[in-house]
């Protein structure tokens, strides 16, 4: 298992909520890529493919998100000051061989100008 | 260790139906992609049909779309394969096998159809 | 369907010579970085075995005198020293997209 913090922008903020950008590289072709707040599982997507080389994507801890062929984007909304934590990227790697699990990661800051507007 | 066990072969005249069972154990059995490969006696071998993890996605041969159903049960962790209108041309020792990502990894000892009047 | 062709259809090779297994196939099976071919040994009375993934790359337990190579749509299998318990038959296989297909398969004896 490889640790490290994410070296891209991995936070991008919009309309009160983020958007957590897991980046994976673009030789992978079959994955799950799992986003931890801490050690909480809060967001899952499997990616695999079966004999006929047909795509399944699956989710067991559903969120909003989105797959390219280099990342996956996990969206939460609806943001307040909770919201702030460590939030990592855990990719396990099943194709091409060998199996590899790595983690990255960093600090969700939560700063007043990001959060839900309200109206008065 | 994984083991996958056919069952359900037998004799069956032509236009009747049989039911193929593989008992699945040793690996997580929701987390994998599952097929059937038949083998006529004395050929080589043919893909029959495959599922994706949940069952929501299968994948039929030509030559038996229509007729047989790839069906599985991930809380017994079983695979089957029903099979409807089956004809002499059927006739083949049919595998249960698991997709291992890049090939079929596993495979079953098989169980023989066999269809004849 | 991509259409997959092994030959010879079967070669008697001496015990520790080389024995080189062709394929080809209808269609490149070439895609980004891989080429989506595996090769299988099926010993008599037994099911098929897993020996090649990618064209070239070798399933674990399968011992190094098993090698695969090949591009787009040639490929070989190659046994550098042929065992006793090589006596098989090995077929190609492609997931390039479905239907998936096996080559007819080539035999392999002891001559």
């Known amino acids: 298992e490889i640790n490290g913090s994410a070296n891209y922008e991995m936070f991008i903020f919009h309309n009160g909520g983020v958007q957590i950008l897991c980046k994976y590289p673009d030789i992978v072709q079959q994955f799950k890529m799992q986003l931890l707040k801490g050690g909480q599982i809060l967001c899952d997507l499997t990616k695999t493919k079966g004999s006929g080389n047909t795509v399944s994507i699956k989710s067991l801890k559903f969120c909003h998100s989105q797959l390219s062929n280099n990342s996956v984007s996990f969206f939460l909304y609806n943001l307040d000051h909770s919201h702030a934590n460590y939030y990592f990227c855990n990719l396990s790697i099943f194709d091409p061989p060998p199996f590899k699990v790595t983690l990255t990661g960093g600090y969700l800051h939560i700063y007043e100008s990001q959060l839900c507007c309200q109206l008065k | 260790e994984v083991q996958l066990v056919e069952s359900g072969g037998g004799l069956v005249q032509p236009g009747g139906s049989l039911r193929l069972s593989c008992a699945a154990s040793?690996?997580?059995?929701?987390?994998?992609?599952m097929d059937w490969v038949r083998q006529a006696p004395g050929k080589g071998l043919v893909w029959v049909s495959n599922?994706?993890?949940?069952?929501?996605?299968?994948e039929y041969s030509p030559f038996v779309k229509g007729r047989f159903t790839i069906s599985r049960d991930n809380a017994k962790n079983t695979l089957y394969l029903q099979m409807n209108s089956l004809r002499a041309e059927d006739t083949a020792v049919y595998y249960c096998t698991r997709w291992g990502r890049f090939g079929f990894d596993s495979w079953g000892q098989g169980t023989l159809v066999t269809v004849s009047s | 369907d991509i259409v997959m062709t092994q030959s010879p259809d079967s070669l008697a090779v001496s015990l520790g010579e080389r024995a080189t297994i062709n394929c080809k196939s209808s269609?490149?099976?070439?895609?980004?970085?891989?080429?989506?071919l595996t090769w299988y040994q099926q010993k008599p009375g037994q099911p098929p075995k897993l020996l090649i993934f990618?064209?070239?790359t070798r399933q674990t337990g399968v011992p190094d005198r098993f090698s695969g190579s090949g591009s787009g749509t040639d490929f070989t299998l190659t046994i550098s020293s042929l065992q006793a318990e090589d006596v098989a038959v090995y077929y190609c296989h492609h997931h390039y997209n479905a239907p998936p297909t096996f080559g007819p398969g080539t035999k392999v004896d002891i001559k």
């Open positions: 269609q490149s099976l070439l895609s980004g970085s891989f080429n989506y």
């Open positions: 599922i994706d993890e949940s069952g929501s996605i299968t």
């Open positions: 040793g690996f997580t059995f929701s987390d994998y992609w």
């Open positions: 990618y064209a070239s």
